[in-house]
Each structure stands twice: as C-alpha cells, then as structure tokens.
Interface confidence: low
C-alpha cells in the first residue's frame, strides 16, 4: 500500500492531560492538537492509536501529512476537515483502522491539495456516493486525489446495509466523474464478487489497480481497453477460472501493463486453451511460471505453461459450480 509516510525527525507532543481538543479560534501556527504529535519541519501530524472519536478541530495549518490511524471515529461528517483558513497544504491523509463505518457526502471537501487518501481497514457500511466528489451534480469539480487506498473496507456481514457492497463503492468512485485524475486505486480484500465495468472505463488515468484477495470469478464484462496508462493490475487470490480471448487481447494491447494472477483456481479444460497459448507468448504476466490448475481434479497442480492442447479437454463436463463464467 502507498500510505503516506513521514520523514519527521522531531515531534512535539501536546500535554497528555488535555481533553480532546475543541477550539473555536484559529490555531496558533505551532499549536499541536491534544493527543497528537506534530512536526512542523516535516509538515506532519500524527494522532495515532489515541481512540479519538472525532477529527481534531485545531489541526495546524501547515499540515501536509496527517495520520489519524487506530482511532474510533465512527462517522466522517460533511466538511470533517473544513477549516478557516483551510488546510490548504494537506496532501496525504491516512484514516486506516479508525473504525469508520460511515463516510458522508462532502467529507473531504475544502482540501484543495489532497492527493493521497487511505481509508483501509474501516468497516464502511455506509459510503456516500458523494464522499469523494462532494457534490450530487452529474459532473462535479475534479478531485485532486491521485491515490485512493480502500483495502479491506468491507464491513462484517451483520453490519452491511441491505445493498450491494460493490455497487456502493463503485457509486462513490464514479459520482460526478470527480476522480478522473486518479492514478492508484487499491480495492484489495473486499469480497468483491464482480468488477463493475464502469469503474475502469471512467477512471482513464489509472496506473495501478489492486483487486487482489477478492472473490472475482470472471472478467467477462470488464474492459481494459481505455486504460492505456495502466502499469500494474493485481488480481492475485481471487476466484478466477479462466481469462477469455477478449480480455487477453485487451491486456496484451496495454503498453506498460504488468499483470499478477497468482493463487487463482484456474480450470484447465478446453476453455483454457487460448489462455495457455497466450501465457506462453506474453511478457505481461508476472510470475506466470507459478500459475497452476485447480480443476479438474486430474489436472490439479499442473503448471499452466507446461500444458498443451491435448491436456485441455471438456470431457467429462465439470459440475455447474466449476464451469467457466
């Protein structure tokens, strides 16, 4: 993950006995919120593992890197980071592991320089469609976000809203076409059953896409054609059974792509022939020599690159649950 990191050398801590800071006045330039550590030289504020239940109001205006990890924020309301004067320098915001279950519309408004946002490891039962766009207009102002890290944001089953989790996340990514400049998107470990096709078509600037450790069975509906800048596509640890010709051709046509396909339950029957042929010829798949068959039983652990057409038959027919989709 590309979470913001700090090169800070000297941090000042606020007095430990102070209550969680609530200030009606603009902060002094060198003020550090209660329960946080600040380094003006590194333009970094760390409020880490302090069980904060809200974003401190008195964040220093100089902050570029803000770590609010390991807290108990629960809800990010609209304008959670809106300040007067605005936090005009804030570029990297890490909110991972802070027990967020709701991110409301406009939560990240008034952060004109925000390029990197990490919401990983929060059980996001309610992610507003307008969390990142801040507007319900059909086309909103472009977001400055370049990297969006949303690994393991799927809530426990009993806390989910009665709706598609994939649909909720996709709606937030696509609202108002605000994320046209997004270059890195990480969606690992979210139990995705599908990759909704719109995500890729409407995020044309993507360089890095991480969909590892999901439950993707098929890429049949997905088009990579427009992602001419894509450099890495992580599909490890999914439930992929085969990649079909259309997908193979599109991947091969991307000039800078590296694809990661390890640990998928490849079904080595007649439908696999095109993929095997492609694997033998392509340079885009990293670690392609590690890819092995999972089904049918007689083919288990066979290396895909070592198969020939005679190995790949469709007789007997697989159980329905193993047929390629």
């Amino acid at each position: 993950s590309s979470s913001p990191t700090s090169s800070a050398s000297s941090f000042s801590s606020s007095a430990p006995f102070l209550a969680s800071a609530v200030s009606a006045q603009p902060p002094l330039p060198d003020q550090c919120p209660a329960l946080c550590e600040c380094s003006e030289a590194a333009r970094t504020v760390k409020c880490v593992n302090r069980n904060l239940t809200e974003v401190p109001t008195d964040l220093p205006a100089y902050v570029r890197n803000l770590f609010l990890t390991g807290n108990q924020l629960a809800v990010l309301p609209a304008g959670a980071f809106a300040r007067r004067p605005p936090l005009a320098e804030l570029a990297a915001l890490n909110l991972s592991g802070s027990r967020l279950d709701e991110v409301r519309a406009g939560a990240f408004e008034h952060l004109p320089s925000l390029r990197q946002l990490d919401l990983s490891h929060n059980p996001l039962a309610d992610l507003s469609p307008f969390a990142f766009s801040g507007s319900n207009a059909s086309v909103s102002a472009p977001s400055p976000l370049v990297e969006l890290i949303l690994n393991h944001i799927v809530p426990p089953e009993d806390e989910r809203q009665n709706r598609s989790f994939e649909g909720m996340v996709v709606a937030a990514l696509l609202a108002g076409r605000a994320l046209q400049g997004l270059r890195r998107l990480e969606l690992a470990s979210n139990h995705f059953l599908y990759l909704p096709r719109d995500v890729l078509a409407q995020l044309p600037s993507l360089r890095h896409l991480d969909l590892s450790n999901n439950s993707l069975v098929s890429l049949t509906y997905v088009s990579f054609r427009n992602l001419t800048h894509l450099e890495s596509l992580h599909l490890e640890d999914n439930a992929l059974k085969v990649l079909h010709n259309g997908t193979l051709a599109e991947l091969q046509g991307l000039p800078h792509i590296r694809v990661f396909l390890d640990n998928n339950p490849w079904v080595c029957d007649c439908h696999m022939a095109d993929m095997v042929t492609w694997l033998k010829e392509t340079e885009v798949v990293q670690g392609k020599d590690r890819l092995t068959c999972a089904y049918p039983e007689k083919m288990r652990n066979r290396v895909l690159l070592e198969l020939n057409s005679a190995d790949l038959d469709c007789d007997p027919i697989l159980p329905p649950s193993l047929q390629t989709s």
Epitope: E157, F165, G167, V170, L193, D198, P320, S325
Partner: antibody, heavy 117, light 108 residues
C-alpha cells in the same frame, strides 16, 4: 415508505419487444441494486439480471444476454427492463426487486406480459 | 450455475404443526448469501429470512433458518393460517443468481 411501482400488463406478439418500468420511491434510488425476476404461470422464480443505478453497472443472466436490456433514469428514480424477440415461453409476470447481498427486501407488484399470436 | 433443490415439493400440514423445509445447493453457498421468500397466489414474493438465519423486518419469530455449505433449512415452528403459501430459497453467491423450485405448504 419504500415502494416499487411497475407499469401495467402488456400483450405482445411473438418477435416483438416489451419494456417494463419500475418506479422507486421512499429511498435513495442510486444506493440500492435493482434486480429483475420473472415467473412463468405456475412456475418458480427466475433471475434475469441486475442494475446498479448509482454507477449503471449491469449484470445479465447469460440465458437472456442479447435479448434483455436494463436501463435506468436516475432523474425520475426509474429502472427499465426491455426484452426483445419475444417468444410464447416469455409469457410471465416480471418483477423488479430492490436489494442484493441481503436478499430482495422490496418487490414491485409485478407486470404480466403475455406473448400470443 | 448453482442449482437449488427444494424438498419436499409439497408439504401438507395442519395449523399449529411444525414445518421443516429443505434447500440443497449443487455446490457450496456462502451462508451470508442464502435467503428465503414466501409467496402467496397473485402476490409478489416477500423476504422472510436473509443470510440463512436472520429474520427480515416484520417477520414473526415463528420463522427461523439454519444451515451452511450446501444444506439449508427453513422452519416454521407453529403454522398459522396465513403461513400456507409457497416458499423459495435463493442464492446470491454466484452469478447467475438462482432460486429453488419452491415448496408449497398446504392445509391438510
């Protein structure tokens, strides 16, 4: 309260197309998936596909691919299902339903489509 | 596709009796994505149980669900007159989504 109201019954000739509408109210239309399910007379339920109004992502049952088109108009909170090249065995009640992973919690009243020459 | 087989096809019982309906999947289904519906003649289905064992809103607690893997059960502890209907299981685990063929619970 949540409601899904469907368009009225249709009688069509074989080879024709039918377009059924499903108007949602009482909730944020773009936040929930809409599925389409049909039921032939005296038969069980058959899933046709689903549409995510927020992103317009659509997933069809392979059985209907090429014949079914699902669309939505978010401005009027309405989902549509069009089935083309109708056959007599397409005679059924067509339902829209809200929900997804946790079941279809609200259903439309159903639209009877009769295909007869 | 995942085939859901419901048994019995018809269950003839009297009010006050216990009803046990079975749903068997052709391959394993994540229990979070197995649901039950009730349908009465001329009406749309109604969600009864979601995620194998959770009562949907407004459903009386005489209904319960259980199971995992490939075998799931809907139980009605004490049949009321309004419970005589057709019951369907449904999986949202793999596309295409599928329903069982239904079990008709009729008055004996």
């Amino acid at each position: 309260q949540v409601q899904l109201v469907q368009s009225g019954a249709e009688v069509k000739k074989p080879g024709a197309s039918v377009k059924v509408s499903c108007k949602a109210s009482g909730y944020t239309f773009t936040d929930y998936v809409i599925s389409w399910v049909r039921q032939a007379p005296g038969q069980g339920l058959e899933w046709m596909g689903e549409i995510y109004p927020g992103s317009n992502s659509i997933y069809y049952n392979e059985k209907f691919k090429g014949r079914v088109t699902m669309t939505r108009d978010t401005s009027i909170s309405t989902a549509y299902m069009e089935l083309s090249r109708l056959r007599s065995d397409d005679t059924a009640v067509y339902y829209c339903a809200r929900g997804g992973n946790y079941g279809f919690d609200y259903w439309g009243q159903g639209t009877l489509v009769t295909v007869s020459s | 596709e995942i085939v859901l087989t419901q048994s019995p096809a018809t269950l003839s019982l009297s009010p006050g009796e216990r009803a046990t309906l079975s749903c068997t999947a052709s391959s394993s289904v994540n229990s979070n994505y197995l649901h039950w519906y009730q349908q009465k003649p001329g009406l749309a289905p109604r969600l009864l149980i979601y995620s194998t064992s959770n009562l949907a809103s407004g459903i009386p607690d005489r209904f319960s669900g259980s199971g995992s893997g490939t075998d799931f059960t809907l139980t009605i502890s004490r049949l009321e007159p309004e419970d005589f209907a057709v019951y369907y299981c449904h999986q949202y685990h793999r596309s295409p989504l599928t329903f069982g063929g239904g079990t008709k619970v009729e008055i004996k």
